[in-house]
């Protein structure tokens, strides 16, 4: 068990703070909830503190919750590949470029670390080149979320990882908006981190609304499990 992994044996409170600017539309989001890495479970509620969110909530899911991949459930035989927990409590910087097909892009930078007993994800997001009447600024996405695989590989040069995946957003007309994600994680501290073999995270997300919440918001339930590395040969012959 890495030193950081010991911090995730129980339920951990989570705070998310985002400042965004998409095509000049500025906004802020705050979120709170908890994570339980034993089950790879996240429960979070987000509110837009600046009024109505100028982009669809589903376009921010990866920035919020795929931001705290330290809550992914890594099976026993894969724990030595869990970079995310090994970087804690000092945390990691997570940078992404998200290309929305035939539309604009988001660039995000986040610091994910413990502040006291709380896991905090502080994010800056800049979006450019979006069409005002496109799927994103035109709010044409359905309020739901598909399951995805998130592919992880070591980046030994930077003592971190590189992550690639493609998100499929459902559009109201029945078509799909693709969002290509290119992600890089580097540790904040100078302690040792686990550099993984290639593997993936399997994610399942459910979006809902709180009927009593007056502010523009999103309620998120997510389960994330690491996979893609088989037991070693010695395990097979036990």
């Amino acid at each position: 068990m890495s030193k950081g992994e010991e911090l995730f044996t129980g339920v951990v409170p989570i705070l998310v703070e985002l400042d965004g600017d998409v095509n000049g539309h500025k906004f802020s989001v705050s979120g709170e909830g908890e994570g339980d890495a034993t089950y790879g479970k996240l429960t979070l509620k987000f509110i837009c503190t600046t009024g109505k969110l100028p982009v669809p909530w589903p376009t921010l899911v990866t920035t919020f919750s795929y931001g705290v991949q330290c809550f992914s459930r890594y099976p026993d035989h894969m724990k030595q590949h869990d970079f995310f927990k090994s970087a804690m409590p000092e945390g990691y910087v997570q940078e992404r470029t998200i290309f929305f097909k035939d539309d604009g892009n988001y660039k995000t930078r986040a610091e994910v670390k413990f502040e006291g007993d709380t896991l905090v994800n502080r994010i800056e997001l800049k979006g450019i080149d979006f069409k005002e009447d496109g799927n994103i600024l035109g709010h044409k996405l359905e309020y739901n979320y598909n399951s995805h695989n998130v592919y992880i590989m070591a980046d030994k040069q930077k003592n971190g990882i590189k992550v690639n995946f493609k998100i499929r957003h459902n559009i109201e007309d029945g078509s799909v908006q693709l969002a290509d994600h290119y992600q890089q994680n580097t540790p904040i501290g100078d302690g040792p981190v686990l550099l993984p073999d290639n593997h993936y995270l399997s994610t399942q997300s459910a979006l809902s609304k709180d009927p009593n919440e007056k502010r523009d918001h999103m309620v998120l339930l997510e389960f994330v499990t690491a996979a893609g590395i088989t037991h070693g040969m010695d395990e097979l012959y036990k």
Epitope: L15, G31, E32, I47, T49, D210, N212, E213, K214
Partner: nanobody, 122 residues
């Protein structure tokens, strides 16, 4: 554990003003977002106004926007609701509430700690 005690309620004429307070004891006050809710006889308990742990984010129900002002003094562990231009429909028991977390939500279910309430009659 947080204990909340409201004060300042009373009888006031329509168009008048009133300030209700909520004193908290227990853990670090700034760790909690706070809210005011009200309940008229035979009605649901409704969100009135809320304030984040730092005090930097506030939100009001449409029915009180521009008339009520929420504030907090973290040094004194106290939250206030200044109510101006009061109307008969503001008559209710006003409850102070706190949630474990600094983010301001408006849903009743997000609030874990509640005061006993103070009556405001217009």
């Amino acid at each position: 554990q947080v204990q909340l005690v409201e004060s300042g309620g009373g009888l006031v004429q329509a168009g008048g003003s009133l300030r209700v307070s909520c004193a908290a004891s227990g853990r670090t006050y700034s760790d909690y977002a706070m809210g005011w809710f009200r309940q008229a006889p035979g009605k649901e308990r409704d969100f009135v106004a809320g304030i984040s742990g730092s005090g930097g984010d506030t939100y009001y129900a449409d029915s009180v926007k521009g008339r009520f002002t929420i504030s907090r003094d973290n040094a004194k562990n106290t939250m206030y609701l200044q109510m101006n231009s009061l109307k008969p429909e503001d008559t209710a028991v006003y409850f102070c509430a706190a949630r474990t977390g600094t983010v301001l939500f408006t849903s009743r279910v997000d609030y874990r700690y509640w005061g006993q309430g103070t009556q405001v009659t217009v």
